[in-house]
């Protein structure tokens, strides 16, 4: 019952005498495993016996015994799905039908497979695309309906009997759907391949020829052309004649039209295979080719470069760049069309020949002002010398040169004078348009390049000017050498380094910051009284009476300058101490008595100490000692001591008398 068995395998397999056949096969028995398998050659059903007759190539039974002569045929399958077979070697008489007799526990089936074995290896088959065009990649396919694991083969491509360089891709298929060997070759045919024979050769593993297939290539291509020119080198002089001929070496399909092109542009009314140019001019120099078309497209010949030779044309000079800045580089180019190219150039600067300059370009790496002027050139080739033009002008721009600042005043200049300066220069390109002055000040510029300084300052030491065009050039600073009275006169204490104490040796210095001229005289004064004429004022032993306001004067030929008043302070210990009593030195008991410690001290007394007639210090430390109410027993002699940072001083004794009040006397 066919519904119980499902088989898949190729319908027909191909091989040749001595090769092998591999039969991929799968099956499914729906009612259980395979119990018996017989491979028949050309089986025929015998109705009488209800069995198949025919040559048994392979038999497998429940006991698993296989006839020993059947090793040529192998069943590579199993009991439930694989029915693959191999016959190795295969013989011519194996052609026909193979019958696979399958039996399970309850079902039987005969599956038929066709086997076609030829006497000699059959040829592969080459497949080509419907149209092949030059330079378009195509794939050539060589197919052979054979593949067997036990018999390796190879397919090789040949062009006109020579192995092709391109790499072919070979693939094999041994599946239940198909059995084949295929070789694919990717190939870009050129027009020269048209009509050539391509072969696919079947070879065994050792490269021995087995069979082949051949095809002739039909490569469609544009016309292939050759151009010939007279004269052959295509070099002529103006007025000569030139002939060009176009020849078609190949065209598939046949050509239809002819035309000529110069520098890629079609020449009108030139539609024959010959181009005649009479009395050529230099404008006819260029690249010529012929173009012939067919259904594929236009084909062009190689280009012929026609050179019409002529003497150099009138020359012009191009300057890169003018105006040029001094120090920059400049290049001059002599422009003169000529064929052949000029072999020699002569350069002129301001009408004079520039020696050693024979090239098309003149390069000056560092331009100087003297390079300015007219540059002209003349070009020369084998046909003659060109006309030399008037040339090109090089303008060299540079900052103002040799700038100087000049003082117009008579010398010397005194502080407060009006000073006039001018800014001079030697040359400039472009012209000077402005001037700058250093240092900046609120000064007048009455005219271009002139500076007026009203009431010149003592400190206007140097002035520099710059003359400016596109750049500024500074002159070296010029010294005004302004003369002035001594400046910044001040009194400075040289010794002692610390504060002045009574008895110290003291030196005062009269300082000034500057004076022009340098020669000076000094004067010291205190309270309008002249003390000395040296730069220093000295005290061997200073006393408090020397304290006061001091000034010094410094004068030169221009004038004199006084210092600010300087206060001389002398420090001394408390002196001239005395005790004063208020309301007096006799006080009635019960009243108030105030004792004051008076002194002269610098700095002032910072600390007071009081003592009684027993030299006993009292617990009071202020300048005033207040006794309230005063008692009779307060009577006695008192003294005080004053202390400052310099030292101590003491007063003489002062006696306080406290007398009894009338009340006390009355009680007695």
């Amino acid at each position: 019952d066919s519904s119980k068995w499902v088989f898949e395998h190729p319908e027909t397999l191909y091989a040749w005498e001595g090769a092998c056949v591999w039969i991929p096969c799968t099956y499914r028995a729906l009612d259980g495993d395979l119990e018996s398998f017989i491979l028949f050659h050309n089986p025929e059903y015998n109705k009488n016996t209800s069995k198949f007759d025919g040559t048994r190539l392979y038999e497998s039974t429940k006991d698993g015994k296989v006839p020993s002569e059947q090793k040529r045929v192998q069943f590579l399958g199993d009991k439930n799905k694989n029915c693959t077979l191999s016959i190795h070697p295969v013989h011519l008489n194996d052609s026909g039908q193979l019958g696979l007799r399958m039996e399970s526990k309850t079902e039987k089936w005969m599956e038929r497979i066709h086997l076609n074995v030829s006497e000699r290896p059959f040829p592969p088959h080459i497949q080509l695309p419907p149209e092949i065009q030059e330079s378009q990649e195509v794939t050539l396919t060589c197919l052979l309906n054979f593949s067997c694991y036990g018999y390796p083969i190879q397919l090789q491509w040949l062009l006109e009997g020579v192995p092709m360089r391109q790499a072919a891709v070979t693939s094999t298929s041994l599946t239940i759907k198909s059995v084949f060997t295929r070789s694919e070759l990717k190939f870009s045919p050129q027009w020269s391949h048209h009509g050539k024979i391509v072969t696919c050769q079947l070879q065994d593993a050792d490269g021995k020829f087995l069979s082949n297939d051949t095809v002739q290539l039909n490569v469609k291509h544009t016309p292939k052309l050759e151009i010939k020119v007279t004269p052959s080198d295509a070099i002529v002089r103006e007025g000569d004649s030139v002939t060009m001929t176009c020849e078609v070496s190949s065209s598939n399909p046949e050509y239809t039209t002819v035309s000529w092109l110069k520098d890629g542009t079609s020449l009108k009314k030139q539609n024959t295979f010959t181009l005649n140019l009479r009395e050529v001019t230099k404008d006819q120099s260029g690249k010529y080719c012929c173009q012939v078309s067919n259904d594929v497209g236009p084909g062009r010949s190689e280009e012929v470069f026609l050179q019409v030779q002529y003497a150099p044309e009138p020359s012009t000079v191009q300057i890169l760049h003018s105006p040029a800045v001094e120090g920059s580089q400049v290049e001059f180019l002599c422009m003169s069309l000529a064929n052949p190219l000029p072999t020699n150039y002569t350069w002129y600067h301001n009408g004079k020949e520039m020696q050693g300059r024979t090239e098309e370009k003149v390069h000056i790496p560092k331009i100087l002002p003297w390079h300015a002027g007219t540059y002209s050139c003349v070009a020369e080739n084998i046909l003659g010398t060109g006309q030399r033009g008037p040339g090109a002008e090089l303008d060299v721009q540079y900052p103002p040169k040799k700038v100087t600042t000049v003082i117009q005043n008579p010398m010397p200049i005194r502080e407060g004078d009006t000073v006039t300066l001018s800014c001079n220069y030697n040359s400039s390109n472009p012209s000077v348009t402005r001037y700058e002055w250093k240092p900046h000040g609120a000064w007048e510029e009455p005219s271009l390049g002139v500076l007026k300084i009203q009431n010149v300052g003592w400190d206007n030491t140097t002035i520099a000017c710059a003359a400016c065009n596109s750049w500024c050039s500074w002159a070296s600073p010029v010294a005004l050498n302004v003369q002035y009275a001594p400046r910044d006169v001040r009194v400075r204490k040289i010794k002692p380094l610390s504060e002045i104490h009574s008895g110290n040796s003291v030196s005062l210095q009269c300082d000034f910051s500057s004076s022009h001229p340098k020669e000076v005289q000094f004067f010291w004064e205190k309270n309008g009284r002249l003390l000395g004429k040296e730069s220093q004022l000295n005290f061997d032993s200073i006393s408090p009476e020397d304290a006061g306001s001091y000034s010094c004067w410094v004068n030169n030929s221009i004038g004199q300058t006084a210092s600010k008043a300087w206060t001389l302070e002398v420090l001394y210990a408390p002196r001239r101490l005395r005790v004063s009593m208020s309301p007096g030195d006799q006080v009635m008991e019960g009243k108030s008595a105030t004792l004051t410690c008076e002194s002269d001290a610098n700095p002032p007394v910072s600390h007071y100490t009081w003592f009684d007639w027993n030299n006993q210090s009292l617990p009071y430390h202020s300048q005033k000692l207040r006794l309230e109410p005063v008692k009779v027993q307060h009577s006695g002699a008192y003294w005080c001591q004053g202390t400052n940072s310099v030292g101590k001083g003491r007063s003489p004794l002062s006696t306080l008398t406290v007398y009894y009040s009338p009340e006390t006397i009355g009680r007695r």
């Epitope: 003497a311 009138p314 002129y348 301001n350 009408g351 003659g384 006309q387 030399r388 008037p390 002008e393």
Partner: antibody, heavy 118, light 116 residues
Framework: EVQLVESGGGFVKPGGSLKLSCAAS????????MNWFRQAPEKGLEWVAY????????YYADTVKGRFTISRDNAENTLFLQMTSLRSNDTAMYYC???????????WGQGTSLTVSS | QLVLTQSSSASFSLGASAKLTCTLS???????IEWYQQQPLKPPKYVME???????STGDGIPDRFSGSSSGADRYLSISNIQSEDEAIYIC?????????????FGGGTKVTVLG
């Protein structure tokens, strides 16, 4: 409008000197090379001298070399021709001419007449 | 030596076309030349510059009737629809700087007469 006005011509004895001037207007004088041409009575034109824009290049015809001096003042837009050691064959109409392009003598003055005679 | 050759005179009918020739010395056939017009008692007037390839540029105020062309060493001045005011001497000139010397050479001039 381009204008070139020559002046300074006149009568002079052989061996004498004279200075011709040409006042230019209507164009940037310093951008052009300038020439002096002359034309003797009933004769053809003759180039005399050339001066470049910036006075860098100066040329003279062989017939006047060493006797004539061409100069210009770009600030004043004026061209000069100082003539010394004058000869009778220097007698001519003298033209001040602007040069443009290659050698295009594109503007000519009306001319000033010089007669050298004893 | 740089030489310009012109025919001395030519006559043309009013309204006709005139073509004047100026021939350069053979070794100077690539040179640019200039054409000038000189009327009696007047200074020369610049007409045009003509190059070897026939291209030309006319001076200010020159009518379109004037054109230039070239062939080999010949330079041409053409006047179409010639007018009586075109009657003048036409002189060609050429400049060159040879070595360290400038030269400006004139042709002999062609005297043009307009008839009718």
């Amino acid at each position: 409008e381009v204008q070139l006005v020559e002046s300074g011509g006149g009568f002079v004895k052989p061996g004498g000197s004279l200075k011709l001037s040409c006042a230019a207007s209507g164009f940037t004088f310093s951008d052009y090379g300038m020439n002096w041409f002359r034309q003797a009575p009933e004769k053809g034109l003759e180039w005399v001298a050339y001066i470049s824009r910036g006075s860098h290049t100066i040329y003279y015809a062989d017939t006047v070399k060493g006797r004539f001096t061409i100069s210009r003042d770009n600030a004043e837009n004026t061209l000069f021709l100082q003539m010394t050691s004058l000869r009778s064959n220097d007698t001519a109409m003298y033209y001040c001419v602007r040069m443009a392009g290659y050698y295009a003598m594109d503007y000519w003055g009306q001319g000033t007449s010089l007669t050298v005679s004893s | 030596q740089l030489v310009l050759t012109q025919s001395s005179s030519a006559s043309f009918s009013l309204g006709a076309s005139a073509k004047l020739t100026c021939t350069l010395s053979s070794q100077h056939s690539s040179y640019i030349i200039e054409w000038y017009q000189q009327q009696p008692l007047k200074p020369p007037k610049y007409v045009m510059e003509v190059k070897k390839d026939g291209s030309h540029s006319t001076g200010d105020g020159i009518p379109d009737r004037f054109s230039g062309s070239s062939s080999g060493a010949d330079r041409y001045l053409s006047i179409s629809n010639i007018q009586s005011e075109d009657e003048a001497i036409y002189i060609c000139g050429v400049g060159d700087t040879i070595k360290e010397q400038f030269v400006y050479v004139f042709g002999g001039g062609t005297k043009v007469t307009v008839l009718g």
